[in-house]
């Protein structure tokens, strides 16, 4: 469909005009500007950047640009009492200490306010004890240790390698296992790609590089002291003992040079198999404790970080819609970084900046979008998605009534191999159609579409000739919009080749070495991948805000619902005897999915045929599309996770970054064979099937003819 649909539009003001206005050189310039000093949440530097962005968005032509501030719980190291880990001998003398900071990259030696590596929200403490190596500290790793190897982590300090799952899940698992401290480290197996030099000569992690990050288990709560409500001037704050998601044991991250010193002395059990071995020249023994001559030595943690209520600032820009100003399409990404933010977040923020500039240019020429576009520069994402969540809590009533879509814009790149998209099924067709119209930036695909290179490099596992699109998980600012409010959401970035590069994320993630030079020298010298991501993100926003009929296809939801129902049924069928004993049936769910499929098909037929010149009918059909995602929200939320309310998708209980389908049923079935009361456990499975079936049926009915 053409997008030349808003009022007082001229023919050149279409999607093409918007896309043509996006320039790689501008993105490069903005990235440079955003990465010269650290912009840690809660600091003066990040407040100044917020004001700069506010001023520039106004200059670009947005109708209004406001700062929205909140006072939230943040965490910082003690400047005079640094965090570190020691090996102590039997007399308590420190015979080895981990480094207190990362060696600064060339050209940044005199930059002040580089926060040393720390695990945000770690409690203070100085535990000492024997070390146990717990691999990635995943649920299955602790199962291996406790159930198979019969190794007890109670009272031990555990050392876990970063990767595979969100670090907060690692800490939660360690706590549940009874550990009294956690050391996180980056293993070269996960953060050093073979054949590439370490920074500054390449994009690999040097031995002194360390990944920062929060270790919360918020489950969508936002500010730990004000769950469910905005952290405004009159907020009632919980006491720290009642705060949501804070870890209870000290945690600290280190690099692989320091990790080598700890791991090389490990005794106890050999690693259970090859999947527990990294790339250091150490045996990867599990422990507990050190070997032989070192068996009397212990590990001691020294953690002195403090939690402080601190003011944060979101920047919210508005481009008012000409026809439906009460319908919001939101483009948001965060501004705060751990240090320079060369990739995370400023490669995304620079793209948002250029998208705003392009929209502003069109607006100055007399164009307006059909619907209102909101642009957001979120604060304190690194501390638990706090800025976006507090703003959404403050504006939840507006958002749930008016929110059409949310497009996320964190890091634009995590590699330079191909496109990566995670989104609601409602957006599949939008993404497919858009990428067919965009040029591929990939070598060897000159003159070919982005869709073609993406499909070739990242094929769908189910449908031939189509690209892979993943489920939304969490770990980014779309969480509150999608998982809590049920607003259709999507994200896009350029990624690595997951086939050949098995390291987790990108090697320099959240380290001091994530600089402008990292991007300009090694990832995207021509900024062509950034430009492509700007075209995808901006193009999605343009279509969502401007097309007469919302570019959502409800039939794609029907397809995935059937796939997810099949998947969860097959998981349950691993227990055929229990399903029989407790009369567990998925008939209601499959029936609801069938009904959804039929009703979605009929709705799509009506969508082709209705009179688009009738504004009332048009609005009615669009509202049915807009509210479909909302219909998957259960107001009661998932068990023990009240802010994860989407019945079809939630962040995995074992890895916040990953999405799980039918999460209520999945969690009820997980490890069910170990439950003390099987009757109760299978009763909960039945209840979750009931909730899922009801929700799918209820969502289907929102697509039925209204009368």
């Amino acid at each position: 469909k053409s997008s030349n649909e808003a009022t007082n539009i001229t023919p050149k003001h279409n999607m093409k005009a918007f896309l043509d206005e996006l320039k790689a050189e501008n993105i490069k310039k903005f990235l440079y500007n955003f990465t010269q000093i650290p912009h840690l949440a809660g600091t003066e530097q990040n407040f100044q950047l917020a004001k700069q962005i506010q001023s520039q968005w106004k200059e670009f032509g947005l109708d209004s640009v406001e700062l929205a501030h909140y006072d939230v719980l943040l965490s910082y190291p003690n400047k005079t009492h640094p965090n570190y880990i020691s090996i102590i001998n039997e007399d308590g003398n420190e015979i080895f200490n981990t480094s207190l900071f990362e060696p600064p990259p060339p050209g940044y030696e005199n930059v002040s306010d580089i926060v040393p590596p720390f695990s945000a929200f770690s409690p203070q403490g100085m535990p000492e004890g024997d070390l146990v190596y717990v691999n990635y500290a995943r649920t299955e790793d602790f199962f291996k240790l406790e159930r198979d190897m019969k190794i007890n982590c109670s009272g031990k300090i555990v050392i876990a390698r970063y990767g595979k799952v969100f670090r907060g899940n690692k800490v939660k698992n360690a706590q549940l296992a009874g550990a009294k401290g956690v050391i996180l480290y980056s293993d070269p197996a996960d953060y050093f790609a073979p054949g590439v030099k370490s920074y500054p000569d390449g994009w690999n992690l040097p031995g002194g590089g360390v990944q920062r990050g929060n270790i919360l288990n918020l489950n969508g709560a936002g500010d730990p002291l004000t769950p469910g409500y905005p952290a405004n001037e009159y907020a009632y704050r919980r006491g720290i003992a009642e705060a949501v998601g804070l870890p209870s044991i000290p945690v600290h991250p280190i690099g692989y040079y320091d990790a080598q010193k700890l791991l090389e002395k490990m005794g106890g059990s050999a690693p259970p198999d090859s999947s527990w071995r990294g790339s250091l020249k150490v045996p990867y023994n599990v422990g507990p404790g050190f070997t032989g001559n070192f068996s009397t030595q212990k590990v001691k943690m020294h953690i002195h970080s403090t939690n402080e209520v601190t003011r944060i600032y979101n920047v919210i820009g508005t481009l008012r819609g000409a026809v439906e100003p009460d319908r919001y399409v939101i483009l948001g990404g965060h501004r705060d970084s751990w240090v320079f933010g060369g990739i995370d977040p400023q490669s995304g923020a620079a793209v948002v900046h250029e998208i705003v500039r392009s929209f502003g240019t069109l607006k100055k020429e007399g164009w307006r979008p059909r619907r209102t576009i909101l642009f957001a520069s979120w604060d304190a994402e690194e501390f638990g998605l706090l800025g976006s969540t507090e703003w959404a809590e403050e504006n939840s009533r507006l958002l749930q009534e008016r929110g059409v879509a949310y497009i996320n814009a964190d890091s634009s790149i995590e590699g330079n191999y191909t496109l990566r998209v995670d989104c609601t099924p409602l957006m599949y067709s939008l993404v497919h159609n858009l990428t067919k119209e965009l040029k591929s930036p990939d070598e060897g695909f000159e003159g070919k579409s982005l869709y073609e290179s993406w499909t070739k490099k990242s094929p769908s596992p189910e449908f031939s000739g189509m690209p892979r699109i993943s489920k939304l998980g969490s770990g980014n600012d779309f969480e509150v919009f999608f998982q809590r409010l049920g607003i259709a959401s999507g994200r896009a970035r350029y990624t690595k080749n997951w086939e050949t590069n098995k390291f987790s994320g990108y090697p320099l993630y959240h380290s001091v070495y994530e600089t402008y030079e990292l991007v300009e020298k090694f990832y995207d010298p021509m900024f062509k991948y950034h430009l492509t991501v700007a075209q995808v993100r901006g193009g999605m926003v343009f279509e969502l805000a401007n097309s007469i009929v919302l570019p959502f296809d409800c039939r794609d939801y029907a397809v995935v619902l059937r796939k997810y129902a099949d998947k969860i049924y097959s998981i349950s069928m691993k227990h055929p005897q229990e399903m029989k004993t407790y009369s567990v049936s998925f008939d209601s769910l499959f029936s609801a999915v069938k009904n959804f499929t039929e009703i979605a098909s009929k709705f799509s037929e009506r969508l082709q045929d209705f009179d688009k010149s009738n504004p009332i009918v048009l609005r009615m059909m669009n509202d049915q599309l807009m509210f479909l995602e909302r219909a998957f929200i259960d107001p009661l939320g998932l068990p023990d996770r009240p802010f994860y309310r989407h019945v079809i998708y939630a962040p995995s209980s074992h890895n916040k970054y990953a999405g799980e389908s039918f999460p209520g049923i999945y969690d009820a079935l997980f490890d069910i064979e170990s439950k003390v009361d099987p009757s109760k456990a299978w009763g909960e499975v039945k209840r979750q099937i009931y909730v899922a079936a009801f929700t799918v049926q209820a969502a289907a009915e929102t697509l039925s003819e209204v009368a």
Partner: antibody, heavy 115, light 107 residues
């Protein structure tokens, strides 16, 4: 009740390969390491290698490296050990054992290598 | 490879008497030692893991002790059904290795 049931005795010629199966029941298959051990007549036990059924991660005794392959089929909760390039000194009883500490053992499979 | 040396090769003990079996590792293995019992024409059975923890269902007359390089399995009061070969094994480093075994008989 945990059970490991191995395939029957085999007679092989030198240079051939043998694949021994180990069907498990009574526990969650992916949770326990599977080891393979052999015992030559009147001799001690010799560890050959192991596998993590959850992710297929293996470790082999260097002595057998290149000759032994351990695999699993999660759908049937079965582990397999294949030994190639057989020689007469490979004549032994081959055991699978479940659990990192070799908690539960199969009944053993006699493999005779003879020309 | 770590060598596990068991002594004695065989041991004859009267019913009701104590039997003490030794196992020495060629290098420090901490407490990463397990003990197995193998009766004639049967598969081995796990008795003791982590040097001193009895496996489920193992009678309390079986006791394991030791750490580092020296380990002991004690049968406090030998019963007729305890006649078997007993193997120690280290799980501290690859390849996992077994001792040659100690044969326990009734005197």
């Amino acid at each position: 009740e945990v059970q490991l049931v191995q395939s029957g005795a085999e007679v092989k010629k030198p240079g051939a390969s043998v694949k021994v199966s180990c069907k498990t029941s009574g526990y969650t298959f992916t949770e326990y390491t599977i080891h393979w051990v052999r015992q030559a007549p009147g001799q001690s036990l010799e560890w050959m290698g192991n596998i993590n059924p959850n992710n297929g991660g293996t470790t082999y005794n260097q002595k057998f490296q290149g000759r032994v392959t351990i695999t699993v089929d999660k759908s049937t909760s079965t582990a397999y050990m294949e030994l190639s390039s057989l020689r007469s000194e490979d004549t032994a009883v081959y055991y699978c054992a479940a659990g990192w500490n070799f908690d539960y053992w199969g009944q053993g499979t006699l493999v005779t290598v003879s020309s | 490879d770590i060598v596990m040396t068991q002594s004695p090769d065989s041991l004859a003990v009267s019913l009701g008497e104590r039997a003490t079996l030794s196992c020495r590792a060629s290098q420090d293995v901490g407490t990463a030692v397990d003990w197995y019992q193998q009766k004639p024409d049967q598969s081995p059975k796990l008795l003791i893991y982590w040097a001193s923890t009895r496996h489920t269902g193992v009678p309390d007359r079986f006791t394991g002790s030791g750490s580092g390089t020296d380990f002991t399995l004690t049968i406090s009061s030998l019963q007729a059904e305890d006649v078997a070969v007993y193997f120690c094994q280290q799980i501290n480093s690859y390849p996992l290795t077994f001792g040659a075994g100690t044969k326990v008989e009734i005197k």
